[in-house]
């Protein structure tokens, strides 16, 4: 398997009892404005494949995406949550700037692909329901980085 | 094919300690999380934690904290839970299972283990 | 602290559809799990991620949800279905695997 280098957060940074709670409550806004139950982003079919050792660099790419292409563009939305949980995300994305994979990743990036593909083709809804999984995406990120 | 074998029944005395072990086979043993999961006679189902086999680490359910130690030994995929002080109500069958990511559903569950706490 | 309900008791013919609740305090975010389990014998994952369901389960078991229940329907029941049913979510915020209380489901 690919060796990862750097994929490593520390725990403190989810044992910051606010701005969880923060994250939880965007997610939980986001999700009571997302009508398409049907279809989930953060789940089997984005770990499939990927081992436990790989998820860190997984939920690295995820977090990027979701900050660049859901989070930034919809940040007038969810007020307030969203000042207080973009930049901490933000924070999280930066020290992960040097989490990378030696060897091959193309596995990976089909797996984070079809997930940009499903937000993409959702539109304004895919952002939502992205913003509604910030729960997942924040005990994701905990579970494969620390 | 893929399966969770554990180890045989135990009978134990209050203030003991227990020691289950569940071995996995058929799949990469560290790309699943193992969880505990016990049920006593005639009751429901009740999470008590899981171990990450890849790094070691552990998340006990709040009930569970300071008596129970969930580990792994990589070399033989296997997990073990120890529940120490044991007391009469912790009387029941205890299950491993495994999961994906740490909060998904359990897809494949090992055969039980009583354990019976009795003087 | 997520709580989940079932009730404690299903009776349904041969042939007929049962539908077993599984409610809980605003799981609208959540995902839910079925598991059946038989006497004597571990639990065995029916429908995840509220209607999927694992290769091996017949198509009669799906699941489905509305606000803040969540339903596993039977249809054509057999006796071989006779068993108890759980559901389960992840609480993530505490971060806890929590299941509902169960529901014995009798074949008459």
């Known amino acids: 398997a690919p060796i990862s280098s750097h994929c490593r957060l520390d725990k403190s940074n989810f044992q910051q009892p606010y701005i969880t709670n923060r994250t939880f409550m965007l997610a939980k806004e986001a999700s009571l404005a997302d009508n398409n139950t049907d279809v989930r982003l953060i789940g089997e079919k984005l770990f499939h494949g990927v081992s436990m050792s790989e998820r860190c660099y997984l939920m690295k790419q995820v977090l990027n995406f979701t900050l660049e292409e859901v989070l930034f563009p919809q940040s007038d939305r969810f007020q307030p949550y969203m000042q207080e949980v973009v930049p901490f995300l933000a924070r999280l994305s930066n020290r992960l700037s040097t989490c990378h994979i030696e060897g091959d990743d193309l596995h990976i990036q089909r797996n984070v692909q079809k997930l940009k593909d499903t937000v993409k083709k959702l539109g304004e809804s895919g952002e939502i329901k992205a913003i509604g999984e910030l729960d997942l995406l924040f005990m994701s990120l905990r579970n494969a980085c620390i | 094919q893929v399966q969770l074998v554990q180890s045989g029944a135990e009978v134990k005395k209050p203030g003991a300690s227990v020691k289950v072990s569940c071995k996995a086979s058929?799949?990469?043993?560290?790309?699943?999380?193992i969880h505990w999961v016990r049920q006593a006679p005639g009751q429901g189902l009740e999470w008590m934690g899981w171990?990450?086999?890849?790094?070691?680490?552990?998340r006990y359910a709040q009930k569970f904290q300071g008596r129970v130690t969930m580990t792994r030994d990589m070399s033989i995929s296997t997990a073990y839970m120890e529940l120490s002080r044991l007391r009469s109500d912790d009387t029941a069958v205890y299950y491993c299972?495994?999961?994906?990511?740490?909060?998904?559903?359990?897809?494949?569950w090992g055969q039980g283990t009583l354990v019976t706490v009795s003087s | 602290s997520s709580v989940l309900t079932q009730p404690p008791s299903v009776s349904v013919a041969p042939g007929k559809t049962a539908r077993i609740t599984c409610g809980g305090n605003?799981?609208?975010?959540?995902?839910v799990h079925w598991y059946q389990q038989k006497p004597g014998q571990a639990p065995v994952l029916v429908i995840y991620?509220?209607?999927d369901r694992p290769s091996g389960i017949p198509e009669r078991f799906s699941g489905s949800r509305s606000g803040n229940t969540a339903t596993l329907t039977i249809s054509r029941v057999e006796a071989g279905d006779e068993a108890d049913y759980y559901c389960?979510?992840?609480?993530?915020?505490?971060?806890?695997?929590?299941f509902g209380g169960g529901t014995k489901l009798t074949v008459l």
């Open positions: 389960q979510v992840w609480d993530l915020f505490n971060d806890n695997g929590v």
């Open positions: 058929g799949y990469t043993f560290s790309d699943y999380y």
């Open positions: 299972a495994r999961d994906l990511t740490g909060f998904d559903p359990f897809d494949i």
């Open positions: 605003n799981f609208r975010n959540k995902r």
């Open positions: 991620y509220d209607s």
């Open positions: 171990v990450n086999p890849d790094t070691g680490g552990t």
